[in-house]
C-alpha cells in the first residue's frame, strides 16, 4: 500500500504545529526534564513486516491524539493550534487505516504485534503519569510537547523507511 504524498506533508504540518504550541522557554523548565524511555527499538530498522510497522505507527498517532485531546490539554495549549493538530492526526490515522485494509488479505496484521503496541502504550502511560504528578503545570506540558516532537520525528523516519522499501 502506498501512503499518499499528503501523508508526509501532514507529518511535517503536525511537527510545525507542535513547535508552535510552545508557550514558555524550554530553558526555564530544565529542572522538570524527564526521560520517558521512548521505545526506540520498536522504531529501529528491525525486520518489520509492513503491516506491523503500520500498526505501531497507528498506535503512536492514536496515543498522541488521546494525549492531546483531554480537557487538561485544552486548558494548557492553544485551542486553535490543537484543532489543526487534530485534523492532521486524524488524516494520518485514516491513511494508515486505509493501508491496513488494503494489506489485510496478504498479512495477518493488527493482532500479531502486541509487544510492540504495548511498548508504545506504556511509553504514553509514563507521559500521562508524569503530567499527573506535575499537576499539568506549564513546564510539564513544555517537557511533554518537546518529547512528542522527538518521538513524532522518529516515527516519521520509520514511515520514510517504509516508503523507500516499496
Amino acid at each position: 500500500c502506498d501512503l499518499p504524498q499528503t501523508h508526509s506533508l501532514g507529518n511535517r504540518r503536525a511537527l510545525i504545529l507542535l513547535a508552535q504550541m510552545r508557550r514558555i522557554s524550554p530553558f526555564s523548565c530544565l529542572k522538570d526534564r524527564h526521560d520517558f524511555e521512548f521505545p526506540q527499538e520498536e522504531f529501529d530498522d528491525k525486520q518489520f513486516q509492513k503491516a506491523q510497522a503500520i500498526s505501531v505507527l497507528h498506535e503512536m498517532i492514536q496515543q498522541t491524539f488521546n494525549l492531546f485531546s483531554t480537557k487538561d490539554s485544552s486548558a494548557a495549549l492553544d485551542e486553535t493550534l490543537l484543532d489543526e493538530f487534530y485534523i492532521e492526526l486524524d488524516q494520518q490515522l485514516n491513511d494508515l487505516e486505509s493501508c491496513v485494509m488494503q494489506e489485510v488479505g496478504v498479512i495477518e496484521s493488527p493482532l500479531m504485534y502486541e509487544d510492540s503496541i504495548l511498548a508504545v502504550r506504556k511509553y504514553f502511560q509514563r507521559i500521562t503519569l508524569y503530567l499527573t504528578e506535575k499537576k499539568y503545570s506549564s513546564c510539564a506540558w513544555e517537557v511533554v510537547r518537546a518529547e512528542i516532537m522527538r518521538s513524532f520525528s522518529l516515527s516519521i523516519n520509520l514511515q520514510k523507511r517504509l516508503k523507500s522499501k516499496e
Epitope: S55, N66, S69, E97, M101, V104, L111
Partner: antibody, heavy 126, light 110 residues
Framework: EVQLLESGAEVKRPGSSVRVSCRAS????????ISWVRQAPGQGLEWMGR????????NYAQNFRGRITITADKSPLTAYLELSSLRFEDTAVYYC???????????????????WGQGSLVTVSS | EIVLTQSPGTLSLSPGEGATLSCRAS???????LTWYQQKPGQSPRLLIY???SRATGVPDRFSGGGSGTDFTLTISRLEPEDFAVFYC???????????FGQGTKVEIK
Amino acid sequence: EVQLLESGAEVKRPGSSVRVSCRASGDTFSSYPISWVRQAPGQGLEWMGRILPALGVTNYAQNFRGRITITADKSPLTAYLELSSLRFEDTAVYYCASPSADIIPSILGTTLFAFWGQGSLVTVSS
Amino acid sequence: EIVLTQSPGTLSLSPGEGATLSCRASQNVSRHYLTWYQQKPGQSPRLLIYGGSSRATGVPDRFSGGGSGTDFTLTISRLEPEDFAVFYCQSYHSPPPVYTFGQGTKVEIK
C-alpha cells in the same frame, strides 16, 4: 471504563424532528468516535453514523443521509443525534456506542462498540 | 456494501448443550474486523468477541469465535441459563467507515 448516558424517551409526530443526547463520562477521549445505533421493536441493530468529537468529523450510513445530523460538544463530552422527517418506522430505541481505548491495537479498537448507552426510546405516532 | 447473514434465525437448546452460530459475509471480511455481541431482553448489547476470536473483558471462556474470509462462527461450549439471548455479528470496513450488523440469532431455552 466509559459510561454513556442518554436523554429520556420521546414521542414525536410524523414529519417532525427528534434530538437525542448522549453524555460520556469516565475514561473518555474526544479522539475516539461515538456512534449511533438504533433498534426497532423486535428487530436487529442498525448503525446510523458516527462523530469524532475532537474534530466534529461525521460519517453517516447511506440509509439516513439527508435526514441525520450528528454533532458533539467536547466538554462535557456529549454527542447529539438529530433525525428529521420522522416516519412511523423510525420508532426505535436509539443507542449511542463507543469503542474502547484498552483494546490492543488501537487500529482495532475503533472498529467495534465496547460501551453502550442505556438506549432512548423514540416513538413516532400521530 | 457488505451484508452479514446470520443463521439459524432461532436456536432452541437446553442448558448444558453446545451452540454454534454462523455469520456469513457477502464479501471477504478480515477476521480482525469481525465482532460478536450478546443482547438480553430490555438490555443494551454487550461486547462479546472482537478481532474474530478475542474475548472481551469478563467474557467466560465457554464463548469462542472463529472463521475467516466470508464464514465466521460463534461457539458456546456449554450453555448456562444466563447465556440465552440474541447474538449479533458486526463487521467494519473503511474508508469511509461503515459498520454492518447481521440480523441476529436468538438462542432460546428448549
